[in-house]
Each structure stands twice: as C-alpha cells, then as structure tokens.
C-alpha cells in the first residue's frame, strides 16, 4: 500500500512536489524531425521539493527522508517524480508517409516523492 503521507507543504504554497505544465513546441522538444502533430504540447511534469514525509510514495521514501535528515551529505532527499502518466498519441513521419503512434510515458498525470 502506498503511504502517501501529507499533502500539506511546509515550505509554502507551490513549493513542494506537484504537477506543473509547460507549453512546448516540437522544436523545443527536439521532435521536429520526426513528429508532425501536435505542433505544440502541454507538457505536464513533476517539480518541487520533497520535505519530510510529503507525498511519500512508499516506505523506502520515508526511510530516505529520515536518513537524509541525519546524513544530508551522503543520503539525498527523495525526488519528485511522476506517479502515473497520461497517454498521448503523435502523428509521426515514416519512410512511407505518416502514422499514428501512442506513448504511455510522456506526460505526468500526478506526482509523488521517491
């Protein structure tokens, strides 16, 4: 079971691990040579700090938090990463024309600390 402790950010609003959206063009993403559409993507990603027990993904993340407090030089704090993803379909260039391809790990759906 996921021990998703604490959705209250002690660092202040918007400072802790959360979903963030950035509008990006195919050129920004480096996809222009193989993707035709969409020409712009609302990229959802996970950003922010992971203070003690905030959105801990599992017990390992809780242990990591505790050890980071004791040994910050050797144990890093948990990282804010996607907990799940939204699928996305792209129209791609192929040798013979164009095709559809679906990707299940491009866009973050929600975030946690691990």
């Amino acid at each position: 079971a996921r021990a998703r402790n604490g959705d209250h950010c002690p660092l202040g609003p918007g400072r802790c691990c959360r979903l963030h959206t950035v509008r990006a063009s195919l050129e920004d993403l480096g996809w222009a040579d193989w993707v035709l559409s969409p020409r712009e993507v609302q990229v959802t990603m996970c950003i922010g700090a992971c203070p003690s027990q905030f959105r801990a993904a599992n017990r390992h993340a809780q242990i990591k938090t505790s050890l980071h407090r004791l040994k910050p030089d050797t144990v890093p704090a948990p990282c804010c990463v996607p907990a799940s993803y939204n699928p996305m379909v792209l129209i791609q260039k192929t040798d013979t024309g164009v095709s559809l391809q679906t990707y299940d790990d491009l866009l973050a759906k929600d975030c946690h600390c691990i």
């Epitope: 035709l36 559409s37 969409p38 020409r39 712009e40 609302q42 939204n86 699928p87 996305m88 379909v89 792209l90 129209i91 164009v98 559809l100 679906t102 299940d104 866009l107 759906k109």
Partner: antibody, heavy 119, light 110 residues
C-alpha cells in the same frame, strides 16, 4: 461552447459521389484533431480516420483506406468526408468527433449525418 | 468482429449497480488506456470516462471506470431510467489504431 455541426442527411444512388461536412466552433479548430466514425444501422462504432486540420495530415483505418477521403479547410473551420463512388454498403450514420488534448479519446461529437445509398 | 469484446446487453432495476465489461488483449487494453462512451437512443455518442478512470466535467460520479490487466469495466451505481443507452469502450490497438467494443445495451427494468 465547443460545437461540431454536421451537414444534413443525404440520399444517393450507387456510383454517385458525396462530400459531407463538419464545422467546428467555440475552440481553435487547428489545435485539435478531427476523427470520423461510422455507425451502420443497428451496429456499433467504427473508427474511419483522423485529420490534423492545421497541417492537413490524414491517417486512415486499414478498413477504410482507399474507400474514403478525409480533408479539411481551416479557413472555414470545416472537416470533410468524401466518397467518389458510393455503394449500398456505405449506408450508415457518420459522426465527426474532436479529439481530446492527448489524441487518445473523442471529447466532442457532431450530431451525425445519415447517408442512405439505394437504387 | 470487434477487437474489444463487450456483452451485448445488461440490465438492472432502478437504484441498482451494474457493470459492463470490456475485454481486450496485450496489444490494446493490456498496455494502454480505455475510454467509455454513452449513446442515448437517437443521439450521438458522448464521452463518459477517459484514460481508464477519469470523468469529464458534467458526468455524474455514479459512473466510474477501472482497468485490470487486459480487461476494463464501467460501473454505474444508483441506476436511473435515463441511463438506458448503448455503452461503448474504446482503446488503441497497435495494428488498427483506434478501436471500439461492439457496444452494450443497458436496459433499466421496471
């Protein structure tokens, strides 16, 4: 309010040509793909193909490749589905539908255009 | 023959809970998402659930979706007369792109 308004019902003879339309409003027409879906009488939904109205890229279901042509005119926010030679088996309700942001589902649908092909 | 398999019909009395199944394979539901559409008699389909378990705004929380392995389910609780409709699941298949189930006719008894 997002709306997709399709052209009216058509009655045609086998061998005739036809072009039906789907006009989008209430959103940026070039920012969302448009798909076409067939529903034969008393049957289920079948995906026919998709167009990106911004770049006019089209991709067809293998079942409909070469049978129909999908196009769009972004200047009037309209997508089209056309046949060069209709068959009786083309008799069906045809729906246009807008794709959601990630291209994985259809979030808005037109009211449908009934095409009847009979001699 | 649809790539996704649904029961042709299900029924339930008002207030009851009913589920509609959608069975696929490792090339569609098994690795990707499922969406559900409701088609009321004589009308166009309407998006009911997307990406397995998300409801668009305006869809009552009586409707919920889930996915496990190569199958998905649509659950309707507190069944109402106006829920009588055809329900379609839809996913992605590596060979034929967007695929629909054959549809399930929901009858509200009484």
């Amino acid at each position: 309010e997002v709306q997709l308004v399709q052209s009216g019902a058509e009655v045609k003879k086998p061998g005739e040509s036809l072009k039906i339309s789907c006009k989008g409003s209430g959103y940026s027409f070039t920012s969302y793909w448009i798909g076409w879906v067939r529903q034969m009488p008393g049957k289920g939904l079948e995906w026919m193909g998709v167009i990106d109205p911004g770049g006019s890229y089209t991709i067809y279901s293998p079942s409909f490749q070469g049978q129909v042509t999908i196009s769009a005119d972004k200047s009037i926010s309209t997508a089209y589905l056309q046949w060069s030679s209709l068959k009786a088996s083309d008799t069906a309700m045809y729906y246009c539908a807008r794709y959601g942001r990630y291209g994985t589902y259809f979030d808005y649908w037109g009211q449908g255009t009934l095409v009847t092909v009979s001699s | 023959q649809s790539v996704l398999t649904q029961p042709p019909s299900v029924s339930g009395a008002p207030g009851q809970r009913v589920t509609i199944s959608c069975s696929g394979s490792s090339s569609n539901i098994g690795v990707l998402y499922v969406n559900w559409y409701q088609q009321l008699p004589g009308t166009a389909p309407k998006l009911l659930i997307y990406s397995n378990d998300n409801r668009p705004s305006g869809v009552p929380d009586r409707f919920s979706g889930s996915k496990s392995g190569t199958s998905a389910s649509l659950a309707i609780t507190g069944l109402q007369a106006e829920d009588e409709a055809d329900y379609y699941c839809q996913s992605w298949d590596s060979s034929s792109n967007y695929v629909f189930g054959g549809g399930t006719k929901l009858t509200v008894l009484g």
